[in-house]
Each structure stands twice: as structure tokens, then as C-alpha cells.
């Protein structure tokens, strides 16, 4: 297993609709044809997998059914979008990239993106 640098933004604020997007960029030492991207969430020293996708030569990442993630890729950049976020989902979201093929296998883990989610205030009753 060889190490690889992965860069991602330090902080992202989710939209009022609970959607957060960020770019995960990896420094590929060669021409990988099969890449696996995993988003991990770290909160209270617990790490859980949010979503994962393996992609090849295309620009659309396909996630498992009912995943809260969507994504596209361009070169060594992966554009990730996480949907359905609520305030309780605030935490550090870590991008993990694996170059699966061809050998050698490379693994890179980013420092994480702190995603802040603020639940929208309910609309006040209107007199109109």
C-alpha cells in the first residue's frame, strides 16, 4: 500500500435545504483506471461510512441505492454532494481515495471537511 495526498476544503456550510458540496482532489502518481472514493464522517471520535463509489473512465459516480451522496469526477477531482443533512449531521467529513487498478494500490485520506448544518427556522405564521 502506497500513500497518496488528498486535498479537500476545511469548512463547508450546508444550504438551507440540507445540501453540502465539496471537492476532493487526489494527487495521482500514475494513470489510474479504477478509483474508489469513500466519504467518512467523524464525530465524537466515532468514524462511520457515509457513502462510497467506484468509478472508471466516466464522469458520473454511481452510489448504492438510498445513498445520500451524488458525485461527478473530472481528472483527479471528485465533486461530492451530500443531501438530506440536518443539524445533528454537523461533523467532519473525510474523503478517502483508493486507486484500485492498475497496481500498485494507493491509498489517500484527506484531513476532512467540517460541514456545518443549520436547521432552517420554521416560518412564522402570517396574517396574510
Amino acid at each position: 500500500c502506497k500513500a497518496m495526498h488528498v486535498a479537500q476544503p476545511a469548512v463547508v456550510l450546508a444550504s438551507s435545504r440540507g445540501i453540502a458540496s465539496f471537492v476532493c482532489e487526489y494527487a495521482s502518481p500514475g494513470k489510474a483506471t479504477e478509483v474508489r472514493v469513500t466519504v467518512l464522517r467523524q464525530a465524537d471520535s466515532q468514524v462511520t461510512e457515509v457513502c462510497a463509489a467506484t468509478y472508471m473512465m466516466g464522469n458520473e459516480l454511481t452510489f448504492l441505492d438510498d445513498s445520500i451522496c451524488t458525485g461527478t469526477s473530472s481528472g483527479n477531482q471528485v465533486n461530492l454532494t451530500i443531501q438530506g443533512l440536518r443539524a445533528m449531521d454537523t461533523g467532519l467529513y473525510i474523503c478517502k481515495v483508493e486507486l484500485m487498478y492498475p497496481p500498485p494500490y494507493y491509498l489517500g485520506i484527506g484531513n476532512g471537511t467540517q460541514i456545518y448544518v443549520i436547521d432552517p427556522e420554521p416560518c412564522p405564521d402570517s396574517d396574510f
Epitope: G58, D65, Y101
Partner: antibody, heavy 115, light 106 residues
Framework: QVHLQQSGDVLVKPGASVNLSCKAS?????SYWINWIKQRPGQGLEW???????????YYNEMFTGKATLTVVTSSTTAYIQLSSLSFEDSAVYFC????????WDQGTTLTVSS | QIVLTQSPAIMSASPGGKVTITCSAS?????IHWFQQKPGTSPKLLIY???TLASGVPPRFSGSGSGPSYSLTISRMEAEDAATYYC?????????FGGGTKLEVR
């Protein structure tokens, strides 16, 4: 030029298993998914699953779990689908298609399950 | 799984006429892709990533849409366009196709 060539049409009895092949040429085999698609007579397209030829990574449509098994032999740039415990409902045309974009398809293999 | 509903299921158009086929997803998808299939042949990639024409596809074909609603348009129908058209999503597994729209020439 890119070409996908499947095995010939097959007639089998219920309960049997069958292996269909998809021989790829004209591109780097390990750089693209191989997808398998089923089409029953007069019906639409159903995605069975896909395999990454380099690593062997597979994804299946749950509807075909236990029915279909995808494999590859990279040395011969050939992908295979094994269909087991065949029933009449498995009678269909089976296609293989290349990559994320399904940009090249083979001509299809007709599988007929009949007693 | 994401269900793609195509409409209409069957339609006819006169040569030179405009044709629009819609594809509605049960959940928002990143892109929709379109295939054309003529009887006895394998499907052919027509449009990918919602609006990009595949190599060799005539410019009378176009695709558009976002979120859950997409469409395929033929600006001027030609006899050779008679076929069944399928939309497809690759946002989540399992990959799914629409039920198809059979387009006949009037």
C-alpha cells in the same frame, strides 16, 4: 476499432446453467466496465450487473443475485456471465455493453430455456 | 431503486415533425442518458450526460432537463428515427432504464 463479440445463441433445459461470453477488442480492456443487460421478447432493458475487469469489482442488480455471476479473464479480454437454475423467465436476449456510457454493445445472445 | 417513467409509451410522428419524449425519475438524478433501439438490433447510445450527443448522432436530436424531469427532442422527424427510445440513470445502483417509448413514422 472497439468491438464486443458474444457467443452464439443457446438452447438449454430448465434447471440447467449456462455461460455466455463477451470478447472485447480494440481498446484497453481493464479501463472500462463490462455491463450485462437482459431484454425479454418485446420488453424493455434490465441491467443485470457490471464488472471492472482489472480488479474484478462487481455490482449486481439485487433482482439477479443468485441468478447471475460475472467474471472476466483479462488475458483473453473476455467477460463471462453465468446464469444458473434456469427457468422459462430467463429466456431473453443478453447483451454486454462497455463502460460507464454503454457506448458499445455486442449483437446480443438469445438464450432459450425450453424443455 | 430509481424508477424511470417514460411518456408516451407509444407515439407516431410525421416526417419533418417535432418529437418530444419525456423521462421522469422517482428521485433526483445527476444525469439522464438516452438510447435508441431498432427491431432486431442492439441499443445505440444517443445522448449522454443529459444533453451531450454521442459520436455520429445527427444534430436534430437533443436532450435537456434536470432533477427528476428530462426530455429527448427530435427537431425534425425522419423515417430512420422510427425506433424505441430508452432513458437510463446511473446515479445509484441498480442502474435502471425507462420502460421505453416506441416512435413510429406516420
Amino acid at each position: 476499432q472497439v468491438h464486443l463479440q458474444q457467443s452464439g445463441d443457446v438452447l438449454v433445459k430448465p434447471g440447467a446453467s449456462v455461460n455466455l461470453s463477451c470478447k472485447a477488442s480494440g481498446y484497453t480492456f481493464t479501463s472500462y466496465w463490462i455491463n450485462w443487460i437482459k431484454q425479454r421478447p418485446g420488453q424493455g432493458l434490465e441491467w443485470i450487473g457490471r464488472i471492472a475487469p482489472g480488479s474484478g469489482t462487481t455490482y449486481y442488480n439485487e433482482m439477479f443475485t443468485g441468478k447471475a455471476t460475472l467474471t472476466v479473464v483479462t488475458s483473453s479480454t473476455t467477460a463471462y456471465i453465468q446464469l444458473s437454475s434456469l427457468s422459462f423467465e430467463d429466456s431473453a436476449v443478453y447483451f454486454c455493453a462497455r463502460g460507464d456510457y454503454f457506448d458499445y454493445w455486442d449483437q446480443g445472445t438469445t438464450l432459450t430455456v425450453s424443455s | 431503486q430509481i424508477v424511470l417513467t417514460q411518456s408516451p409509451a407509444i407515439m407516431s410522428a410525421s416526417p419533418g415533425g417535432k418529437v418530444t419524449i419525456t423521462c421522469s425519475a422517482s428521485k433526483s438524478v445527476s444525469y439522464i442518458h438516452w438510447f435508441q433501439q431498432k427491431p432486431g438490433t442492439s441499443p445505440k447510445l444517443l445522448i449522454y450526460d443529459t444533453s451531450t450527443l454521442a459520436s455520429g448522432v445527427p444534430p436534430r436530436f437533443s436532450g435537456s432537463g434536470s432533477g427528476p424531469s428530462y426530455s429527448l427532442t427530435i427537431s425534425r422527424m425522419e423515417a430512420e428515427d422510427a425506433a424505441t427510445y430508452y432513458c437510463q440513470q446511473r446515479t445509484t445502483y441498480p442502474l435502471t432504464f425507462g420502460g421505453g417509448t416506441k416512435l413510429e413514422v406516420r
